[in-house]
Interface confidence: low
């Protein structure tokens, strides 16, 4: 009685199983009663992932400058191009199919955690001791400059966006 | 390939403004920088500021802050940089530059606008 | 704001011959991701600058492998390895670690 099931890493076809191509190949021909299954490797630039039945091996993904995207992991026989983003930019979704600037963090605000190619910029507001006075993707908040250990006192309070501002004592005569 | 094409040379009186023009073509407008860089006569390079014509987003040079303002029009893949108040100091040559993704420096420049400011 | 100071001021070198420019930051241009941001810029007369170096030590698309760039934390070099004629120009280095963005003053390169 012919076959209603196949094993694993084959496929049913005409009533009978054939082998499926393995990852990196394509299908020629399906097998016959008298020949196996025949597959030819993928040609540069595509790939097929898994064991098949395809006629087509799929094209490599484009990491498209245009969009922020570059190369991670050059694809083969048997994987996808993986892109990720230039620097200074991050994905818009798992598959990372195109990219967004980086958040600054705004004056007032320093950068908790520096953007990597999946996540934006983390901003956390300065604590007080701390300023920036900038916008940035790189830069932390700064702690305000101690008057003290340079022997002069603070003229002027320090605020979340601007440094103390520190002057000579006033000596006794 | 990458252009970027400015606006033409510009004489204005002291105390007016100037806006000048960049339009960009060979790459998408919106997923670069542009920035805009002073060279008064004889001179070396300013850094004045830029802009991210996607969200709109600008950073100034604190010495132009107030001075100069930054626009862009995705539609027309076109970058602007105002002055005003202008004065005879401001006299110089302006370039557009984009600023390349993974490089974070100015790979591409427009040819420059003169801007003279006199009497 | 970073000061970055070019030395010399103006350099005159025979064809063929290594040309040095240096450029010293008034603080570290390295950042935490080991990234340097110093650039080098080519002016000459009547145009744009033009990217040479990028982020230290990577020659830009179409410059020629005489042109090379070195240097860590503060202290930076850029070498023409061999002078040509064509490199007569005014040459700028330049930061994007931290907003403003500066310039150094300009090294002009002569043929001697």
């Known amino acids: 009685e012919p076959p209603t099931a196949c094993r694993e890493k084959q496929y049913l076809i005409n009533s009978q199983c054939c082998s499926l191509c393995q990852p990196g190949q394509k299908l020629v021909s399906d097998c016959t009663e008298f020949t196996e299954t025949e597959c030819l490797p993928c040609g540069e630039s595509e790939f097929l992932d898994t064991w098949n039945r395809e006629t087509h091996c799929h094209q490599h993904k484009y990491c498209d400058p245009n969009l922020g995207l570059r190369v991670q992991q050059k694809g083969t026989s048997e994987t996808d191009t993986i892109c990720t983003c230039e620097e200074g930019w991050h994905c818009t979704s798992e598959a990372c199919e195109s990219c967004v600037l980086h958040r600054s963090c705004s004056p007032g605000f320093g950068v908790k955690q520096i953007a990597t190619g999946v996540s934006d910029t983390i901003c956390e507001p300065c604590p007080v001791g701390f300023f920036s006075n900038v916008s940035s993707a790189f830069e932390k908040c700064h702690p305000w400059t101690s008057c003290e250990t340079k022997d002069l006192v603070v003229q002027q309070a320090g605020t979340n966006k601007t440094d103390v501002v520190c002057g000579p004592q006033d000596r006794l005569r | 390939q990458v252009q970027l094409v400015q606006s033409g040379a510009e004489v204005k009186k002291p105390g007016s403004s100037v806006k000048v023009s960049c339009k960009a073509s060979?790459?998408?407008?919106?997923?670069?920088?542009m920035n805009w860089v002073r060279q008064a006569p004889g001179q070396g390079l300013e850094w004045m500021g830029n802009?991210?014509?996607?969200?709109?987003?600008?950073n100034y040079n604190q010495k132009f802050k107030g001075k100069t303002t930054l626009t862009a029009d995705k539609s027309t893949s076109t970058a602007y940089m105002e002055l005003s108040s202008l004065r005879s100091d401001d006299t110089a040559v302006y370039y557009c530059?984009?600023?390349?993704?993974?490089?974070?420096?100015?790979?591409?420049w427009g040819q420059g606008t003169l801007v003279t400011v006199s009497s | 704001d970073i000061v970055l100071t070019q030395s010399p001021d103006s350099l005159a070198v025979s064809l063929g011959e290594r040309a040095t420019i240096n450029c010293r930051a008034s603080?570290?241009?390295?950042?935490?991701?080991?990234?340097?941001?110093l650039h080098w810029y080519q002016q000459k007369p009547g145009q744009p600058p033009k990217l040479l170096i990028y982020k230290l030590t990577n020659r830009f698309f179409g410059v020629p492998d005489r042109f090379s760039g070195s240097g860590s934390g503060t202290d930076f070099t850029l070498t023409i390895s061999s002078l040509q004629a064509e490199d007569v120009a005014v040459y700028y280095c330049q930061q994007s670690i931290h907003v403003p963005w500066t310039f150094g003053q300009g090294t002009k390169l002569e043929i001697k």
């Open positions: 060979g790459y998408t407008f919106t997923g670069y920088n």
């Open positions: 802009i991210d014509p996607y969200y709109g987003n600008t």
């Open positions: 603080q570290s241009l390295v950042h935490s991701n080991a990234n340097t941001y």
């Open positions: 530059a984009r600023l390349g993704l993974q490089l974070y420096a100015l790979d591409y």
